[in-house]
Interface confidence: low
């Protein structure tokens, strides 16, 4: 496996101001070893591992305001440890493809 | 950047448990790319239950297979082609 912490840029949207700020953070990316069982035993747990967080912390950033909107605080998750493990569907949207970490609904991106 | 060379590609390999001399059972195994990151606001808005993290993943699965019966009467899949595609058993 080669699932590891990777530097990424995430976009944090300030919806009421129609802009995003970009933040450099760490998240998980890489390759995980999986196999497709030849004998499908209903009683046997089937586990496919994905590159996801093992430990995470939350960081808070001040997002600047605009015209009639004050600055606000935005809290986002940061991975501190990665592994090839089950996707925790309670906290995670387990999908084939999402919008990507730096998706911004608006044209303007502030550094 | 994560290195593909650290992990063997998703391919057919012999399954030692169900294979017999002259009658190999092949199984898809190997690595596929996945990543996780904070869920963008746009995605959160479409969720009934908001999830803070998005995990994009594909798994090494059989694209095609033949069903065969092996010793002991077990019905198994003899995989004939593999690909990195939708993971079905990766959620807890």
């Amino acid at each position: 496996n080669s699932c590891e912490l990777t530097n990424i840029t995430i976009a944090i949207e300030k919806e009421e101001c129609r802009f995003c700020i970009s933040i450099n953070t760490t998240w998980c990316a890489g390759y995980c070893y999986t196999r497709d069982l030849v004998y499908k035993d209903p009683a046997r747990p089937k586990i496919q591992k994905t590159c996801t967080f093992k430990e995470l912390v939350y960081e808070t950033v001040r997002v600047p305001g605009c015209a009639h909107h004050a600055d606000s605080l935005y809290t986002y998750p940061v991975a501190t440890q990665c592994h090839c493990g089950k996707c925790d569907s309670d906290s995670t949207d387990c999908t084939v493809r999402g919008l990507g970490p730096s998706y911004c609904s608006f044209g303007e991106m502030k550094e | 950047a994560p290195d593909v060379q650290d992990c063997p590609e998703c391919t057919l390999q012999e399954n030692p448990f169900f294979s017999q001399p002259g009658a190999p059972i092949l199984q898809c195994m190997g690595c596929c790319f996945s990543r996780a990151y904070p869920t963008p606001l746009r995605s959160k808005k479409t969720m009934l239950v908001q999830k803070n993290v998005t995990s994009e993943s594909t798994c090494c699965v059989a694209k095609s297979y033949n069903r065969v019966t092996v010793m002991g009467g077990f019905k198994v899949e003899n995989h004939t082609a593999c690909h990195c595609s939708t993971c079905y058993y990766h959620k807890s």
């Epitope: 990507g100 | 950047a1 990543r35 593999c82 595609s85």
Partner: antibody
Framework: EVQLQQSGAELVRPGTSVKISCKAS????????LGWVKQRPGHGLEWIGD????????NYNEKFKGKATLTADTSSSTAYMQLSSLTSEDSAVYFC???????????????WGQGTLVTVSA | DIVMTQATSSLSASLGDRVTISCSAS??????LNWYQQKPDGTVKLLIY???SLHSGVPSRFSGSGSGTDYSLTISNLEPEDIATYYC?????????FGGGTKLEIK
């Protein structure tokens, strides 16, 4: 050796459609995303969208939604792009290109086809 | 969309020269940048991926560097076969976008 062989040049009338192909060889077709890129003189390279033949998943550049339709035939390891309601703006060279990471749309394009020239003219 | 700018559209250099081609992004792209070479016959090849990693089969005279919004491709000892147009491309955020290209010519 990875190869992407594209179909030949097309001369088409405005308002019609054209379907160009990209035949892949030298790798497992279903394991890699295949993208399409447009090149017009003076306009550089533009990413149109991509397709994952292993599941039929597609992703489009907003600019090309409704213009381009991406499909793949896994039995012949061939990807297709159909362009509809053609205008002179669609006259360009179109490339198919494969991603470097198996199972991932990430990472740009490691291998490129030779390009297909589409000319839209009355 | 992230706008990729290659300020120099054409560049003239002599054989054996060290040539640097630059590319800037309209926002930080976390090193998610590739460099491509397009020969006069239209053939496109990946040279450098993830800012500085050399793609297999690419001569070691090609190198890449940069961070944040500013990136560059360097050819340390210009050879006749390096005559081509060079494009940068970001894969940090969809849609993937390319620079306008820098055409390299021999003096």
């Amino acid at each position: 050796e990875v190869q992407l062989q594209q179909s030949g040049a097309e001369l088409v009338r405005p308002g019609t459609s054209v379907k160009i192909s990209c035949k892949a060889s030298g790798y497992t077709f279903t394991n890699y995303w295949l993208g399409w890129v447009k090149q017009r003189p003076g306009h550089g390279l533009e990413w149109i969208g991509d397709i994952y033949p292993g599941g039929g998943y597609t992703n489009y550049n907003e600019k090309f939604k409704g213009k381009a339709t991406l499909t793949a035939d896994t039995s012949s390891s061939t990807a297709y792009m159909q362009l509809s309601s053609l205008t002179s703006e669609d006259s360009a060279v179109y490339f198919c290109a494969r991603t470097p990471l198996y199972g991932s749309s990430y990472g740009g394009f490691a291998y490129w086809g030779q390009g297909t020239l589409v000319t839209v003219s009355a | 969309d992230i706008v990729m700018t290659q300020a120099t559209s054409s560049l003239s250099a002599s054989l054996g020269d060290r040539v640097t081609i630059s590319c800037s992004a309209s926002q930080g792209i976390s090193n998610y940048l590739n460099w491509y070479q397009q020969k006069p016959d239209g053939t496109v090849k990946l040279l450098i991926y993830y800012t500085s990693s050399l793609h297999s089969g690419v001569p070691s005279r090609f190198s890449g560097s940069g961070s944040g919004t500013d990136y560059s491709l360097t050819i340390s000892n210009l050879e006749p076969e390096d005559i081509a147009t060079y494009y940068c491309q970001q894969y940090s955020k969809l849609p993937w976008t390319f620079g306008g290209g820098t055409k390299l010519e021999i003096k």
